[in-house]
């Protein structure tokens, strides 16, 4: 039975040209996290594997940095980076947990962080 929940940074906004940290946290389970995949809509951005460490997709290497922790840092943001991001936690023995983050990249200098929210 899957008892865990993923807490994410939720709906967030950031300035064009700036950086943002995408962060998810798995709680309420003793399951072992074996791998975390980060996806942007239909693109694989990066993978963090318990044994192999990080793999950043080559097409994102210039603008994506691993961490902190199991999170992901996006740099040199453009308006095209606006959209949904997913953290997919592969765990044993529970299975797969998915968290969603919506990022809005703003032209203006006013970029406020949204509230945290949970996905069961």
């Amino acid at each position: 039975m899957m008892t865990g929940t993923i807490e994410t940074t939720g709906n967030i906004s950031a300035e064009k040209g700036g950086s943002i940290i995408l962060q998810c946290h798995l709680s309420s389970t003793t399951a072992q996290v074996t791998q975390v995949n980060w996806e942007q809509q239909d693109q694989l951005l990066a993978i963090c594997n318990a044994d192999l460490g990080w793999h950043i997709s080559p097409s994102f290497k210039d603008r994506v940095a691993p961490g902190p922790g199991l999170g992901l840092t996006l740099q040199s943001l453009t308006v095209n980076d606006t959209g949904e991001y997913f953290c997919i936690y592969h765990t044993y023995p529970d299975g797969t947990y998915t968290g969603r983050i919506f990022l809005e990249v703003l032209e203006s200098s006013v970029a406020e962080h949204g509230a945290r929210f949970q996905i069961p």
Partner: antibody
Framework: EVQLLESGGGLVQPGGSLRLSCAAS????????MNWVRQAPGKGLEWVAG????????YYADSVKGRFTISRDNSKNTLYLQMNSLRAEDTAVYYC???????????WGQGTLVTVSS | DIQMTQSPSSLSASVGDRVTITCRAS??????LNWYQQKPGKAPKLLIY???SLQSGVPSRFSGSGSGTDFTLTISSLQPEDFATYYC?????????FGGGTKVEIK
């Protein structure tokens, strides 16, 4: 240099058993998921089974479920495929392949031929 | 199970030609799509992983694109050593499945 070397293939009668081995070298075997993929004569590729690294979770194609068992011995850097109740349609070249991040298969062995015939 | 449909099943081309092979998944697989090349009597060789990432050591004339359900492998300028069979494969979910293959032959 990464190397995968399959062995254990041969001729076996229908209903018989065979155990394939894949000896790995040149990388930290225990850190990688591993797969068996087969190819019947003149046909395409068919994934048979996979085993993850951290969890050791095992996955099978429906066509072999209940008959084949994938396993690994990390101390011997070896992957196995135990094949029971073999059928004529299991005749194929069997490849072992390394599966980093369980997303792609980057290194393959040279294959071992299994022929099931009376 | 996710079905992978490759087209065409075979094609004839000349050295220097631009060749495009397509692969369609029966459901969305994000970018969990890989391309392999196989020559007769040899093991498959990884060309492209995660839809568009070029495997180390593979010539840059090979490229991959697509996401969701529709994917493409392109060889920008076909070389003599590229005549082979090409397979797509999804790793979105088990059972892992391959396309039926595309045989690239000399015209």
């Amino acid at each position: 240099e990464v190397q995968l070397l399959e062995s254990g293939g041969g001729l076996v009668q229908p209903g018989g058993s065979l155990r394939l081995s894949c000896a790995a070298s040149g990388f930290t075997f225990s850190s990688y998921g591993m797969n068996w993929v087969r190819q019947a004569p003149g046909k395409g590729l068919e994934w048979v089974a996979g085993i993850k690294s951290s969890s050791g979770n095992k996955y099978y194609a429906d066509s072999v479920k209940g008959r084949f068992t994938i396993s690994r011995d990390n101390s011997k850097n070896t992957l196995y495929l135990q094949m029971n109740s073999l059928r004529a349609e299991d005749t194929a070249v069997y490849y072992c392949a390394r599966g980093p991040y369980d997303v792609w298969m980057d290194y393959w062995g040279q294959g071992t031929l299994v022929t099931v015939s009376s | 199970d996710i079905q992978m449909t490759q087209s065409p099943s075979s094609l004839s081309a000349s050295v220097g030609d631009r060749v495009t092979i397509t692969c369609r998944a029966s459901q969305s697989i994000s970018s969990y799509l890989n391309w392999y090349q196989q020559k007769p009597g040899k093991a498959p060789k990884l060309l492209i992983y995660a839809a568009s990432s070029l495997q180390s050591g593979v010539p840059s004339r090979f490229s991959g694109s697509g996401s969701g359900t529709d994917f493409t492998l392109t060889i920008s300028s076909l070389q003599p050593e590229d005549f082979a069979t090409y397979y797509c494969q999804q790793s979105y979910s088990t059972p892992l499945t391959f396309g039926g293959g595309t045989k690239v032959e000399i015209k």
